[in-house]
Amino acid sequence: SERCDDWGLDTMRQIQVFEDEPARIKCPLFEHFLKFNYSTAHSAGLTLIWYWTRQDRDLEEPINFRLPENRISKEKDVLWFRPTLLNDTGNYTCMLRNTTYCSKVAFPLEVVQKDSCFNSPMKLPVHKLYIEYGIQRITCPNVDGYFPSSVKPTITWYMGCYKIQNFNNVIPEGMNLSFLIALISNNGNYTCVVTYPENGRTFHLTRTLTVKVVGSPKNAVPPVIHSPNDHVVYEKEPGEELLIPCTVYFSFLMDSRNEVWWTIDGKKPDDITIDVTINESISHSRTEDETRTQILSIKKVTSEDLKRSYVCHARSAKGEVAKAAKVKQKVPAPRYTVELACGFGAT
């Protein structure tokens, strides 16, 4: 067959759907690869063709659109499963073509099973709620387009295994779940199950997301440097190892980039000739406040190194701070035989 622009397998779109549930999958060509939409393509005389390669097979085969009850169908640029079966897992290709033009892309579809508590291999989106911040809501995700607005579905919300009912601070409100005041105890997996009728059949959509309660912007502060500080002096003799930790606390801030770095005599360590290594470790509190520690290390410090200025810097969306470490050369201890003896008046 003639040449076709093949965008390959779009692994960025690893689509996971639950067994025995409806799934609507848009052809990725129009979302990520082409500069025009399906309507434009269709009115220009282009045809959208679907085929698939089932799991552990190399053979591309057409999709059977003549299954009982139209289990698999195509509508515009959407491939519909009503519902999915486990063996629908495979790589699906949508190809847009006419006699002079051809473009195609493949994407993996994985049909997964869930257990009785909605656990599954599904990758879960994470929704962050601010601690003690007032009413916040999560919305049952990815259910648009499954049923018309005239259909009134029923929605059941679960936390883990249990229906959400009589919770002190969590209230199901249709497609939304309201947290009156989010607490650490609200961390966990939340599942909404949307049930709706269609053509004399009942369908269910299961959507699980992870809720993580994080620090509130009301409590956020600029970075706090705990070390170095004015109470600790790094006193070394030449030849010894110099280790200076820079420990910085960052309040949780949504989408903030937290940075810690050292300067030596105003320059980044990479820009100077001395043999410096820097090791970083990061820890998080339960509300995702962050503590970063960068340990500056000079294996064999020289007297020149001990005269330099070592400054720890930190920056977040809340501001920038810096703190110099107190470094000095250790005064050698007196040598007993000579200095002490002299002091006793020995000649």
Partner: antibody
Amino acid sequence: QVQLVQSGAEVKKPGSSVKVSCKASGYAFSSSWMNWVRQAPGQGLEWMGRIYPGDGNTHYAQKFQGRVTLTADKSTSTAYMELSSLRSEDTAVYYCGEGYLDPMDYWGQGTLVTVSS
Amino acid sequence: DIQMTQSPSSLSASVGDRVTITCQASQGINNYLNWYQQKPGKAPKLLIHYTSGLHAGVPSRFSGSGSGTDFTLTISSLEPEDVATYYCQQYSILPWTFGGGTKVEIK
């Protein structure tokens, strides 16, 4: 399209056990709850318990705890309800009922179990 | 266990009549209530789930309402094929429990 076909009527002696089967088709057997409900002659409905074939998780009504065992064979899409230490008051029609969530969307045709000496 | 009390236990109405059956729970069940229809000699069928959600394929003359502990099944215009026993069932807290049933007959 969902079908639940139960095994035939049974006559049992007091003290014995009965095992009723329920063969499912037309849906993903592993991904739905299978409930068991009984109905004594001329009486109402009584929930006995349920099993999730996907992971074998079970819940039983306290009244039947220790006397009823629910199992499921995923390879044949068949659920089983075994009731032991039968007594005359266990004479009833036993139904299996499938539910994706908690409501029992579809029911089997029922199996009459008669306990008589 | 949650007790479910249905009333009346039986009723007789004419074709075309509006029929109302009530169900009371011994404690709040957060709308987790189903209604089933059982015709003589047959298995029950789900009519309504979650208080008011019409099950697929069920005629629109059936509707459900209520909240807290008090719930209602309404048949807006009784048809001859509606002769059956109707059961409410709570699924708020295990074990699931049913009402005693309401037998509906045609006058």
